[in-house]
């Protein structure tokens, strides 16, 4: 487990001719915020995939009003880092998408309006625990400067956050075959995966799945200190020494969750369930209204027009929590019958059926499907003695072995060409057209029919403004 951290240094006009118009004006003040989306690996097939490694939204930046006649300067930025926690190993190679959003603060009916100002994407190789990596990306006439790093959350260490560390049992050296844990030289590498929840500070293991306690600690997860003094109400001897058991300091002791959040222990740390109006790792972000966009994963925000009234997030299927921040493991209900494999795709459940079975939940026994497999989560459907595959989203062909083309819906208008780039589909417009989907004609005088062209969008610009 660990955290990917992104620090935005500046967002403003890039070098070269054609400086963009300021996105804000005296009539229409605005402020910026950023969204980062991370995907593991370098797969070209990830074009339309969700942010499987995680996503994060920044706070809103300071309100900015353009000075009349002045060129667009570097725009004021939100404070702080964007942090994307990752639960499993850091993949080492990843794809990113960073979006710059503009929140217009004029007199719009129904609150502020949001529009995507710029979108950059890239593929990078990055080891966890390394220094900050600096980057510059350009989107049209805009330039984004930022730094990023991945760091492990204790007790994980290493370039992939897969090695675990524990305190040394002896002051001078680590056990046989174990190295010191850089940069924590007073700790030793623990190569084994101990029992889930085994205290990283007070427990260790010599066999996978066990949890042995260091001197002075007891309990199945070594979270309970052994009192060597006499006790008023002893609870029984410990397995290590005879003494009294006192509840040890667990991750939820002292309740790290602010603002009335409730704490629950997880195998490696804790998780806060926040009351409405608060969110963040420790429920520390407050005064939230629907204008702040608190609902994640496509949740719909209702109510909460001012900071004193609560908002409610209506979550899409597959997500729960006061901010739709938690993915529901709907496969735990075992909805797939006849030995089918359950796939939770986020937007839908899919059952990958064994040969001979079909249907949304593998409920149909099909003789003509016996021995005929549909690949990639497709289901076999009976069709008058011949087998036919109903393919999962993103796949096609007779046996669902062909990856469906994000360009199949012909999203680029007026003869524009669509390309299935790893960062998302890209349109290259035919001469005379422009826009994200080549939807706007370019007039002979060079003007476009764009009602209010996003800054930096020029004739022939590719899809970068969604």
């Amino acid at each position: 487990a660990g955290v990917f951290e992104l620090q935005i240094h500046s967002f403003g006009p890039g070098p070269g001719p054609g400086a963009p118009r300021s996105p804000c004006s005296a009539r229409l003040p605005c402020r910026l915020f950023f969204r980062v989306c991370l995907k593991p690996g370098l797969s070209e097939e990830a074009a339309e995939s969700p942010c499987a490694l995680g996503a994060a939204l920044s706070a809103r930046g300071p309100v900015y009003t353009e000075q009349p006649g002045a060129p667009a300067p570097d725009l004021p930025l939100p404070d702080g880092l964007l942090q994307v926690p990752f639960r499993d190993a850091w993949p080492g190679t990843f794809s990113f998408i960073i979006e710059t959003w503009r929140e217009e603060l004029g007199d719009q009916i129904g609150g502020p309006a949001w529009s995507l100002l710029a979108r950059v994407a890239g593929r990078r190789r990055l080891a966890a625990g390394g220094p900050w990596a600096r980057d510059i990306q350009r989107a049209g006439a805009w330039e984004l400067r930022f730094s990023y790093r991945a760091r492990c959350e204790p007790p994980a260490v290493g370039t992939a956050c897969t090695r675990l560390c524990r305190p040394r049992s002896a002051p001078s050296r680590c056990g046989p075959g174990l190295r010191p844990c850089a940069p924590l030289e007073d700790e030793c590498e623990a190569p084994l995966v101990c029992r889930a929840g085994c205290s990283p500070e007070h427990g260790f293991c010599e066999q996978p799945g066990e949890c042995r306690c260091l001197e002075g600690w007891t309990g199945p997860l070594c979270t309970v200190p052994v009192s060597t003094s006499s006790c008023l109400s002893p609870r029984g001897p410990s397995s290590a020494t005879t003494g009294c058991l006192v509840p040890g300091p667990g991750p939820c002791d002292g309740n790290p969750c602010a603002n009335g959040g409730s704490c629950s222990e997880t195998p490696r740390s804790f998780e806060c369930t926040c009351p409405r109006g608060f969110y963040g790792l420790r429920c520390e972000v407050s005064g939230v209204t629907c204008a702040d966009g608190p609902c994640f994963n496509g949740g719909l925000c209702v109510g909460g027009a001012d900071p004193d009234s609560a908002y409610i997030c209506h979550c899409p299927p597959g997500f729960q929590g006061s901010n739709c921040e938690k993915r529901v493991d709907r496969c735990s209900l075992q909805p797939c019958r006849n030995g089918g494999l359950c796939l939770d795709l986020g937007h839908a459940l899919r059952c990958r059926c064994r040969a001979g079975f079909a249907g949304p939940r593998c409920e149909h026994d099909l003789d003509d499907c016996a021995g005929r497999a549909c690949a990639n989560g497709g289901t076999c459907v009976e069709g008058g003695g011949a087998h036919r595959c109903s393919c999962a989203l993103g796949f096609g062909g007779r046996d669902c072995r062909e990856r469906a083309d994000p360009c199949a819906a012909r999203p680029c208008a007026h003869g524009g060409r669509c390309y299935a780039h790893f960062s998302g589909l890209v349109c290259a417009c035919a001469p005379g057209y422009m826009g994200a989907r080549c939807e706007f004609p370019v007039h002979p005088d060079g003007a476009s029919a764009l009602p209010a062209a996003p800054p930096g969008l020029r004739p022939g610009d590719p899809q970068r403004y969604l």
């Epitope: 070209e44 990306q137 049209g140 469906a404 390309y419 299935a420 290259a428 020029r458 610009d461």
Partner: antibody, heavy 119, light 110 residues
Framework: QVTLRESGPALVKPTQTLTLTCTFS?????????MGWVRQAPGQGLEWMGT????????DYASWAKGRVTISVDSSKNQFSLKLSSVTAADTAVYYC???????????WGQGTLVTVSS | DIQLTQSPSFLSASVGDRVTITCQST????????LSWYQQKPGQPPKLLIY???NLEIGVPSRFSGSGSGTDFTLTINSLEAEDAATYYC??????????FGGGTKVEIK
């Protein structure tokens, strides 16, 4: 493993038509790409010849290649091909096939095949 | 016809030097930044270094960087290494689905 591999004759006589084939693996033409041909005469620079867009199989050629070059696709064999008519000694070159998936760059290249035009 | 002019066509530099190669187009590339840079060593196909004017391809050392927009672009090698001896090409993509390559810059280590 995503790969491209060129094949064809190593020696062609002047005035003949050169036919080269690029066999691809690890991806299918159900996605939209430009599949292109680029050549490089000995000791010279790279020269784009033309591309075929797999979305609708439309073709585009360098101005010098129009009328001499034809690019086509056989998706059932995972191949696309180049025909260059009326070859001369000036067409002696290493011929590369390459794939474009957006933002204008060729991200995947074959190893190239040397074709010599000589009588 | 569109022309991409690279300069210099040849340069000799020492290990550790900062090297700059420029690429000038007679027409603006598509989207103002659809320009890429390749490295080619003898007997090998070109290897992509930079795409979209400034994006570093995965696995390419960070000493390589690209900049520019419209018609003028630059490839910079911040601290030249012996393994960087090669020929470097710029390549643009243009409205009308047209590609073009620069003439190349041969980099030699002194």
């Amino acid at each position: 493993q995503v790969t491209l591999r060129e094949s064809g004759p190593a020696l062609v006589k002047p005035t003949q038509t050169l036919t080269l084939t690029c066999t691809f693996s690890g991806f299918s033409l159900s996605s939209s790409y430009d599949m292109g041909w680029v050549r490089q005469a000995p000791g010279q620079g790279l020269e784009w010849m033309g591309t075929i867009y797999t979305g609708d199989y439309s073709t585009d050629y360098a101005s010098w290649a129009k009328g001499r070059v034809t690019i086509s696709v056989d998706s059932s064999k995972n191949q696309f091909s180049l025909k260059l008519s009326s070859v001369t000694a000036a067409d002696t070159a290493v011929y590369y096939c390459a794939r474009h998936t957006g933002y204008g760059y060729f991200g995947l290249w074959g190893q190239g095949t040397l074709v010599t035009v000589s009588s | 016809d569109i022309q991409l002019t690279q300069s210099p066509s040849f340069l000799s530099a020492s290990v550790g030097d900062r090297v700059t190669i420029t690429c000038q187009s007679t027409e603006s590339v598509y989207g103002s930044d659809w320009l890429s840079w390749y490295q080619q060593k003898p007997g090998q196909p070109p290897k992509l270094l930079i795409y979209q004017a400034s994006n570093l391809e995965i696995g390419v050392p960070s000493r390589f960087s690209g900049s520019g927009s419209g018609t003028d672009f630059t490839l910079t090698i911040n601290s030249l290494e012996a393994e960087d001896a090669a020929t470097y090409y710029c390549q643009g993509y243009y409205s009308g689905y047209i590609y073009a390559f620069g003439g190349g810059t041969k980099v030699e280590i002194k």
